[in-house]
Interface confidence: medium
């Protein structure tokens, strides 16, 4: 039968099985989440997009799922990231007491997956799904990440860290999830400071990327929200990870890196 053709790739193969299996694995490795009924989680996930027009999904659609996946990160332990997911995840796998969104149940379930349904049928669309740019922004995947990213930022407290990619033309991008959602949902009553870690790409790159105009823009946005801003250059990400793994290594200087460290009030 006729099915709308979208510009984006279709739902990830074996999507229901993948979500359910990830949920079971997550609750096994995080005994603190054992009260979560994975079948109910899948039902709530499915309910957010199945039989709905995939360009008209709302944050409200995901509220039952968000309620089931309620989790809170301890203060000072939230790590946000923008355009540098792999290093952020490598970091939290070593620094086990810090958490990215993908270390939380809902982020873990959906990481790297695509999904959508279609209006008035209970089928999952494995052929194509709406592309954010070419089709619509209110698609199931984009709205999901906007919803859970908002909540993740809202519940953060203490000093929040963000890892930014220093190799990109826009180190801080206002159109990224971090720039458009998370920055604006940090709560000044709970968050004392945002500390940006700018990750350098080139091995011999000794520039102070904390002086980049886009970082100044981020500083301005954060300061206007009454949150203090700090910035660090991470010149050698490989060294950085090694020193997180083994802080006693003689070549590891005190702190995260031998970098310029800027305090902005």
């Amino acid at each position: 039968r006729w099915r709308q053709q979208w510009s984006g790739s279709g739902t990830t193969s074996r999507f229901p099985e993948t979500v359910l299996a990830r949920c079971v694995k997550y609750t096994e490795v995080h005994p603190e989440m054992r009260h979560v009924d994975c079948q109910s989680v899948w039902d709530a996930f499915k309910g957010a997009f199945i039989s709905k027009y995939p360009c008209n999904i709302t944050e409200e659609d995901y509220q039952p799922l968000v309620k089931l996946g309620t989790q809170t990160v301890p203060c000072n332990k939230t790590l946000l990231w923008s355009r540098i997911k792999d290093l952020a995840h490598q970091f939290t796998q070593v620094q086990r007491d810090m958490f990215t969104l993908e270390d939380m149940l809902l982020g873990y379930l959906a990481d790297d997956l695509t999904w959508c349904g279609e209006f008035n049928t209970f089928e999952i669309n494995y052929q194509s799904c709406p592309d954010w740019r070419k089709d619509c922004s209110n698609n199931p995947v984009s709205v999901f990440w906007k919803t859970v990213s908002r909540r993740f930022a809202e519940t953060a407290c203490g000093v929040v860290h963000v890892m930014l990619n220093g190799s990109r033309s826009k180190i801080f991008d206002k159109n990224s999830t971090f720039g458009s959602v998370e920055v604006h949902n940090l709560q000044p009553e709970k968050v004392q400071a945002l500390e940006a870690w700018v990750i350098h790409g080139g091995r011999e790159d000794s520039r102070d990327l904390c002086q980049d105009p886009t970082i100044k823009e981020l500083e301005s946005i954060i300061s206007k929200r009454n949150i203090r801003f700090f910035c660090k250059n991470i010149y050698r990400p490989d060294k950085f990870l090694q020193c997180v793994k083994n802080p006693e290594d003689s070549s590891c200087l005190s702190g995260i890196s031998a970098s310029h460290h800027h305090h902005h009030h």
Epitope: E32, L68, T72
Partner: antibody
Framework: QVQLQQSGAELVRSGASVKMSCKAS????????MHWVKETPGQGLEWIGY????????NYNQKFKGKATLTADTSSSTAYMQISSLTSEDSAVYFC?????????????WGQGTLVTVSS | DIVLTQSPASLAVSLGQRATISCRAS??????????MHWYQQKPGQPPKLLIY???NLESGVPARFSGSGSRTDFTLTIDPVEADDAATYYC?????????FGGGTKLEIK
């Protein structure tokens, strides 16, 4: 600092119910599971279950289902455990305990315990 | 349920010597690179106190005389050297699977 303050000792008749409390302070009550553990000279330590005050989710040891009921009042940061149809087997010290949270699912903080004595 | 069997049930060790307590699980408590086994110390009239978490990690503030080792089904708590204050009952506990279970306890007496 994290503190768990439990209600005082109870002497109760066989067949009755008892409800004990565990008042939490020094942390966000809704962010961490509250566990309950039973201690008897014969059985040692037994895990009863836990409640997640953030959404009221519970997880019981099958052995205590129908015997223990866990609830939480977020306005007073207090967790409760009710034990029903008491018998001499329920005479024990009951502890509330909190884990370290995400990736730290072991008992880091404990209440001082509530002694329950069942009389016939 | 995963049954944890501790041995010995009690032991007496001279001051300054080594105490070794064993905990055997009825099935593996390892999962995704972690051994979900923890050790507690309990003194009369007090709640248990966490010593070792995830098989071998020393809890903050616990003296380095305490150490944990083992994987899958066999775990060991070692106290070396033993001090007078170590007289207590020691419990292992798993939370790899529900219900979370404790061992029967080992009572340590200092000679």
């Amino acid at each position: 600092q994290v503190q768990l303050q439990q209600s005082g000792a109870e002497l109760v008749r066989s067949g009755a119910s008892v409800k004990m409390s565990c008042k939490a302070s020094g942390y966000t009550f809704t962010s961490f599971n509250m566990h309950w553990v039973k201690e008897t000279p014969g059985q040692g330590l037994e895990w009863i279950g836990y409640i997640y005050p953030g959404n009221g989710g519970t997880n019981y040891n099958q052995k205590f289902k129908g015997k223990a009921t866990l609830t939480a009042d977020t306005s007073s940061s207090t967790a409760y455990m009710q034990i029903s149809s008491l018998t001499s087997e329920d005479s024990a010290v009951y502890f509330c305990a909190r884990t370290g949270g995400l990736r730290r699912a072991y008992f880091t903080y404990w209440g001082q315990g509530t002694l329950v004595t069942v009389s016939s | 349920d995963i049954v944890l069997t501790q041995s010995p049930a009690s032991l007496a060790v001279s001051l300054g010597q080594r105490a070794t307590i064993s905990c055997r699980a009825s099935e593996s408590v390892d999962s995704y690179g972690n051994g979900f086994m923890h050790w507690y110390q309990q003194k009369p009239g007090q709640p248990p106190k966490l010593l070792i978490y995830l098989a071998s990690n020393l809890e903050s503030g616990v003296p380095a005389r305490f150490s944990g080792s083992g994987s899958r089904t066999d775990f060991t708590l070692t106290i070396d050297p033993v001090e007078a204050d170590d007289a207590a009952t020691y419990y292992c506990q798993q939370n790899k699977e529900d219900p979370w279970t404790f061992g029967g306890g080992t009572k340590l007496e200092i000679k």
